[in-house]
């Protein structure tokens, strides 16, 4: 299910130098022929193209990954960068362009023979219920969802949340992923501030349920940044 935990980041409130005038969410942008959408006939406007700030790969387009624009750059400023083509260096699957994955530090073709059941770590979902394909690309998952005929119950191994029964999400548990309950009002939740924080979670929490968002608990506002407790609260 869709995460209704919403970071209310307005586009214009970006760290410099990324948030220029074109970053205003309401700004008028003229349509110009651009990049053809996968599975659609819409064209993305690319005049005045500005890099998109991100915290994780899934915030970027299908042909992008999230990273610092300079080697050894400030980890706090990351943008969506163009994916790496075949035979280019990589550190993780999402860096490689659709149809490829990262093997031994090099992007290689993701032809089915290569996979032999490898599971890519970054899984994304669509708004629709049919999750077997992602924009027609196999970049985000390397196991066919056809393997999952029944919806997983709590504790079942999963690839993505659509593999889990209603009210459950697919979250990391040690070094695999299992179906866990979606968080209810008042339950502690995780608010990710930096990309690196995802990788540290060996016990990942689900997101907050419908109508709830992950916010600082009111009586914790005065606490230090490191000890702030976030809970699922009504919008």
């Amino acid at each position: 299910t869709l995460n209704s935990v919403l970071n209310s980041n307005a586009i214009k409130n970006l760290p410099p130098p990324l948030g220029g005038a074109a970053g205003h969410p309401g700004s008028a942008v003229s349509a110009a022929p651009g990049i053809l959408y996968p599975g659609g006939n819409k064209y993305q406007t690319i005049d005045n193209y500005q890099p998109y700030p991100c915290a994780e790969d899934e915030e970027c387009g299908t042909d992008e990954y999230c990273a610092s624009p300079t080697r050894g750059g400030d980890a706090g400023v990351q943008i969506c960068l163009a994916c790496r083509k075949r035979r280019k260096r990589c550190m993780r699957h999402a860096m490689c362009c659709p149809g490829n994955y990262c093997k031994n530090g090099i992007c290689v073709s993701s032809d089915q023979n290569h996979f032999r059941g490898e599971i890519e770590e970054t899984i994304t979902e669509s708004f629709g219920n049919d999750h077997s394909t992602l924009d027609g690309y196999s970049r985000r998952t390397t196991l066919s969802s056809k393997m999952y005929h029944t919806k997983g119950q709590e504790g079942s191994v999963c690839l993505r949340s659509s593999d889990c029964a209603s009210g459950l999400c697919c979250a990391r548990h040690f070094w695999s992923k299992i179906c866990k309950p979606v968080l209810k009002e008042g339950q502690v939740c995780t608010k990710h501030r930096r990309k690196g924080s995802h990788g540290l979670e060996i016990f990942q929490r689900c997101y907050c349920g419908e109508g709830l968002s992950c916010r600082i608990q009111k009586d914790h506002h005065q606490a230090s940044n490191s000890s702030r407790l976030h809970t699922c609260q009504r919008h």
């Epitope: 970071n7 969506c80 708004f127």
Partner: nanobody, 128 residues
Framework: EVQLVESGGGLVQPGGSLRLSCAAS????????MGWFRQAPGKEREFVAA????????HYADSVKGRFTISADNSKNTAYLQMNSLKPEDTAVYYC?????????????????????WGQGTLVTVSS
């Protein structure tokens, strides 16, 4: 093709609240962005809010920030726009919009109307 049907519009007094819903059907598996735009009489269609495919970002026009909240429920293929503290200038036809995940994304992506497919719209009138 994606079909989008809005509901929840109506007449409300200034300071009041409304919750718009947008039900998506058809080819919903490719949807990655759900948004709301609005068009007041005699004006151009303007961006209101959007929720990204990554589920971690919501984007709002300055004029509605702090008053409107966009959310979505994947299990129902539905997007919502909770509108609080409504003002007369919020009067407009509100359109639900949906788009697939692009190959490349830029800061202007979410507010660019040409990227989206559209519903028929629902009228919101704020008047005393």
């Amino acid at each position: 093709e994606v079909q989008l049907v809005e509901s929840g519009g109506g007449l409300v007094q200034p300071g009041g609240s409304l919750r718009l819903s947008c039900a998506a059907s058809g080819s919903t598996s490719s949807l990655r962005t759900m948004g709301w735009f609005r068009q007041a009489p005699g004006k151009e269609r303007e961006f209101v809010a959007a929720i990204s495919w990554s589920l971690s970002r919501t984007h709002y026009a300055d004029s509605v920030k702090g008053r409107f909240t966009i959310s979505a429920d994947n299990s129902k293929n539905t997007a919502y726009l909770q509108m609080n503290s409504l003002k007369p200038e919020d009067t407009a036809v509100y359109y639900c919009a949906a788009a697939p995940r692009p190959k490349r994304v830029s800061v202007s992506y979410f507010s660019t109307a040409s990227n989206y497919d559209w519903g028929q719209g629902t009228l919101v009138t704020v008047s005393s």
